[in-house]
């Protein structure tokens, strides 16, 4: 199809080489066409058109994304050619940064239902650059945490070194929905609730004498509880002796509950004590069996192919540790009688 009639938007993605970050493009269909498509909630009351010529479907996934090759080849269907780019409804998600994402992206409705719709498309010219200047030493991360129940703020990474007075107007989206009242370089939250978690996008406009473009950044926000003040609990084993049958295989499970820590480096391991000797046992990897906002339960098993007489003289010790401290629970094997 002819893309010369598409509305055009220029975007800049400046990514940090130090951290993983994502990027998104919204299918910003031109007014008035977008009204039946994506982000209808992004229209302000003053923008609602009286005349709605674009009779598209209300299905929010009814758009098609293409990339325009720089060599002038035909448009390529994003879904077929680019595994690191995912379409979710009207949003294109870039999972990995890199200058190779630079290019022209076109979106349009899948279904053309009226003559007006032929030009119902938007071309986004995306420029991707690595961050070069270290002028802003403490620029905000693309992953930010908010402490539940307290005050907090979400900063736009590309503007986090600007004072409020200098900051240009910022357009914020949360999970693809426009936050029309948020216009600052940071969203100040009076009290953090779990619904503040999500994917935030901040846009601001930069101009020179020739043109203007949108600088965009994506911030993943999670809501967290305060770091635990407790060392981990061992939930299992509870008893310090375990009845076993000689010659049979045995699995002993160690389950421990670790309180939330922002920097989480849990340790859970088994070691064996035999008279004056002790050594760590090579056992299967630990696995998380339950994770909540406040804590995580991690399990690690020790597996004996068959219980021997020697095992009865040993102590099997589960050792767990977080940044606060460690806890151990030892198990002595006892032969089952009768």
């Amino acid at each position: 199809f002819n893309i010369s009639g598409c509305s055009t938007k220029k975007l800049l993605w400046t990514y940090s080489t130090r951290s993983e970050e994502e990027f998104v493009l919204f299918c910003d269909l031109p007014e008035p066409q977008k009204s039946h498509f994506c982000h209808r909630n992004r229209l302000s009351p003053k923008q609602v058109p009286e005349h709605l010529p674009f009779m598209g479907s209300n299905d929010l996934s009814d758009v098609q994304w293409y990339q325009q090759p720089s060599n002038g080849d035909p448009l390529e269907d994003i879904r077929k050619s680019y595994p690191h780019i995912i379409q979710d409804k009207c949003t294109l998600h870039f999972l990995t940064p890199g200058v190779n994402n630079s290019g022209s992206y076109i979106c349009r409705p899948k279904m053309i239902k009226s003559p007006y719709d032929v030009a119902c498309c938007v071309k986004m010219i995306l420029e991707v650059k690595p961050q070069t200047n270290a002028s802003c030493e403490y620029s905000a991360s693309h992953k930010q945490d908010l402490l539940l129940g307290s005050t907090g703020s979400i900063s736009c990474p590309s503007l986090s070194c600007q004072s409020d007075a200098q900051s240009p107007a910022v357009t914020w989206y949360k999970n693809g929905k426009l936050l029309s009242v948020e216009r600052s370089n940071r969203i100040v939250v009076d009290e953090v609730y779990d619904y503040h978690q999500g994917t935030y996008v901040c846009d601001y406009t930069q101009s020179d004498t020739v043109s203007s473009w949108t600088v965009r950044a994506v911030v993943q926000v999670r809501t967290i509880v305060g770091d635990t003040k407790l060392k981990p609990d061992i939930l299992d084993p509870v008893e310090d002796t375990l009845e076993v049958e000689l010659g049979k295989p045995l699995t002993i499970s160690c389950k421990a509950r670790f309180g939330f820590e922002r920097v989480f480096n849990p340790v859970i391991k088994w070691y064996i004590k035999d008279s004056d000797l002790e050594w760590e046992v090579s056992v299967p990897e630990a696995k998380s069996i339950k994770s909540t906002l406040k804590d995580e339960i991690i399990e690690r098993n020790i597996i004996l192919e068959k219980v021997t007489q020697r095992d009865l003289r040993r102590k099997f010790v589960c050792f767990v540790q977080n940044s606060i401290g460690n806890t151990t629970q030892s198990v002595q094997l006892k032969e089952k009688r009768g």
Partner: antibody, heavy 113, light 111 residues
Framework: SVEESGGRLVTPGTPLTLTCTVS????????MSWVRQAPGKGLEYIGI?????TTYYANWAKGRFTIAKTSTTVNLKITSPTTEDTATYFC???????????WGPGTLVTVSL | AAVLTQTPSPVSAAVGGTVSISCQSS????????LSWFQQKPGQPPKLLIY???TLASGVPSRFKGSGSGTQFTLTISDVQCDDAATYYC???????????FGRGTEVVVK
Amino acid sequence: SVEESGGRLVTPGTPLTLTCTVSGFSLNSYDMSWVRQAPGKGLEYIGIIYNSGTTYYANWAKGRFTIAKTSTTVNLKITSPTTEDTATYFCARTHNTLPFYIWGPGTLVTVSL
Amino acid sequence: AAVLTQTPSPVSAAVGGTVSISCQSSPSVYNNNRLSWFQQKPGQPPKLLIYYASTLASGVPSRFKGSGSGTQFTLTISDVQCDDAATYYCAGGYSSISDNGFGRGTEVVVK
């Protein structure tokens, strides 16, 4: 900086457009608000124009005012002035939908027969 | 429509003393913190003192302090100076931008 102009004596019903001229920053990047103050009275928020051109008006101001912009100016049109519209009109660079640091000195509009 | 009710004028303060002005919002301001305080002297445009309910604007002396959340807010001026004689306005931002507005103002007279 920000400076308002266009304030003058008008008769009721005669439309009047006020202009706010900005320098040192781009209207492509900042939101702007209009606020007015009747003689001896308090401040009244009229409305805001976003850098994108989207406008919002205070409930009381809807239909009575129109805000628009060019590359360097923000205009406030008083569609059909009445004597109650006599006031000093200020424009201000806006932060998060509320007027912020940079205010103009104001321009006086007098509506009288 | 939102209503911002300020302490009635005038309020007297002695030099070196402390004065508090209250501002009550109905309904709650956006995010419980979208409230600003302005100082205005005759013949001048307003000057921003506080935003986000408690953040001091650049260049404003720390004698000015904003507090409160949701519907109840206070501007406190400690160690009052003669230069603080002015009218003080609160301004609220709301989830419907059309509700944004100012309180009626509180005149502070310094003795």
